[in-house]
């Protein structure tokens, strides 16, 4: 099974280096992430032509994925650690129903789909500590969640792989924009 | 070593699609955190940055050209393509392919380094 | 969408040192080390001087040196050599997800 950052022999801190810091396990869990991402989408792009399909003709779905705006305070421009830093987060727990849609469509990557889902928990953990504004996070009803999971699971199979191409693609530009900005911090 | 080639029509005439054909050797565009772009030179002017596709497949374009460019690939042949529809006389230009992707790029989304780059093919648009 | 902003010329004395401005704005050349430094020699293709702000590409001399403060990036060529002559391009990421190119600088290498 995929290991999570700081569970392999590789991170495990030799006697004399210094331990990882809160930003720099961070940083490395969302590449962690990231790799989780590309792998599954190596099978969603075996199985199906949603790979080929342009990205104007995804957006037509009408899925309401999280995404980075200018009001957010994570571009450089307007930058602000506060409000980006409760962005990320917000945007990180909308993004678990989605990510809980994702366990039931790989067949060889079960377990990495599995791996994406639970280190993006842990990745919200190290968030919510390093966070001074957590009561402006707001967190996703679960009735609300779980009419949404139906409705994406009674899709026919062509608007399933869409979905699932989707989810993965946003999710990947996601986390790069939360990366930039973090470094930022 | 890396090299890269491009190839396609040097006369193109207005309002046609331009069709250009990048091809790689000396390693996989499948493997690795790599990317790939496309960027062009106008004669005695500058380099022009028009678009990448990165490792998963996915595009980026230059917003002022994204509604007439597509980049695709065929990882089977190692090549990717650029197309650029409805041309001028300004997109008469050096077209040049190259890789992108150094260090942490993948991860961050950030292709602005291009370490090889292919010789470059003349594209005049011309009636 | 504008380029990052290049003099379009300069000019050095062999030896000498000369440094070559790049300006942009906080959503390019401010936004990260995102910044990298090209050379192009009359009638060939450009050639990756420096990547991520200050790193030099492989094979590079370390003559060729480079940094950035705020939204404005520098190349610094130290003991200039006249086959340095060339036109000079900085690029950047802009956010969101696309690349930009200085102008680029011709220099003139004077004995």
């Known amino acids: 099974a995929p290991v999570l950052p700081g569970e392999d022999s590789k991170d495990v801190a030799a006697p004399h280096s210094q331990p990882l810091t809160s930003s720099e396990r961070i940083d490395k869990h969302i590449r962690y992430i990231l790799d989780g991402i590309s792998a599954l989408r190596k099978e969603t792009c075996n199985r199906s032509n949603m790979c080929e399909s342009s990205k104007e003709a995804l957006a037509e779905n009408n899925l309401n994925l999280p995404k980075m705006a200018e009001k957010d305070g994570c571009f450089q421009s307007g930058f602000n650690e506060d409000t980006c830093l409760v962005k990320i987060i917000t945007g990180l727990l909308e993004f678990e129903v989605y990510l809980e849609y994702l366990q039931n469509r790989f067949e060889s990557s079960e377990e990495q789909a599995r791996a994406v889902q639970m280190s993006t928990k842990v990745l919200i953990q190290f968030l919510q500590k390093k966070a001074k504004n957590l009561d402006a996070i707001t967190t996703p009803e679960p009735t609300t969640n779980a009419s949404l999971l139906t409705k994406l699971q009674a899709q026919n199979q062509w608007l399933q792989d869409m979905t699932t191409h989707l989810i993965l693609r946003s999710f990947k530009e996601f986390l790069q924009s939360s990366l930039r900005a973090l470094r930022q911090m | 070593e890396v090299q890269l080639q491009e190839s396609g029509p040097g006369l193109v005439k207005p309002s046609q699609t331009l069709s250009l054909t990048c091809t790689v050797s000396?390693?996989?565009?499948?493997?690795?955190?790599?990317?790939w772009s496309w960027i062009r030179q106008p004669p005695g002017k500058g380099l022009e940055w028009m678009g990448v596709i990165d490792y998963d497949g996915d595009t980026y374009y230059k917003p002022s050209l994204k509604s007439r460019t597509s980049i695709s690939r065929d990882t089977s042949k190692n090549q990717f393509s650029l197309q650029l529809s409805s041309v001028t006389p300004e997109d008469t230009a050096v077209y040049y392919c190259?890789?992108?992707?150094?260090?942490?790029?993948?991860?961050?989304?950030?292709?602005?380094?291009?370490?090889?780059w292919g010789k470059g093919t003349l594209v005049t648009v011309s009636s | 969408q504008s380029a990052l902003t290049q003099p379009p010329s300069m000019s050095g004395t062999l030896g000498k040192t000369l440094t070559i401005s790049c300006n942009g704005t906080s959503s390019d050349i401010g936004s990260g080390d995102y910044v990298s430094w090209y050379q192009q020699l009359p009638g060939t293709t450009p050639k990756l001087l420096i990547e991520?702000?200050?790193t030099r590409a492989s094979g590079i001399p370390d003559r060729f040196s480079a940094s950035k403060s705020d939204n404005t990036a520098s190349l610094t060529i130290s003991g200039l050599q006249s086959e340095d002559e060339a036109t000079y391009y900085c690029a950047s990421y802009r956010e969101t997800n696309n690349v930009v190119f200085g102008g680029g600088t011709h220099l003139t290498v004077l004995s």
């Open positions: 190259a890789r992108a992707g150094l260090g942490d790029s993948y991860y961050l989304g950030t292709y602005y380094a291009m370490d090889y």
């Open positions: 991520g702000v200050t």
């Open positions: 000396g390693g996989s565009i499948a493997t690795s955190y790599y990317a």
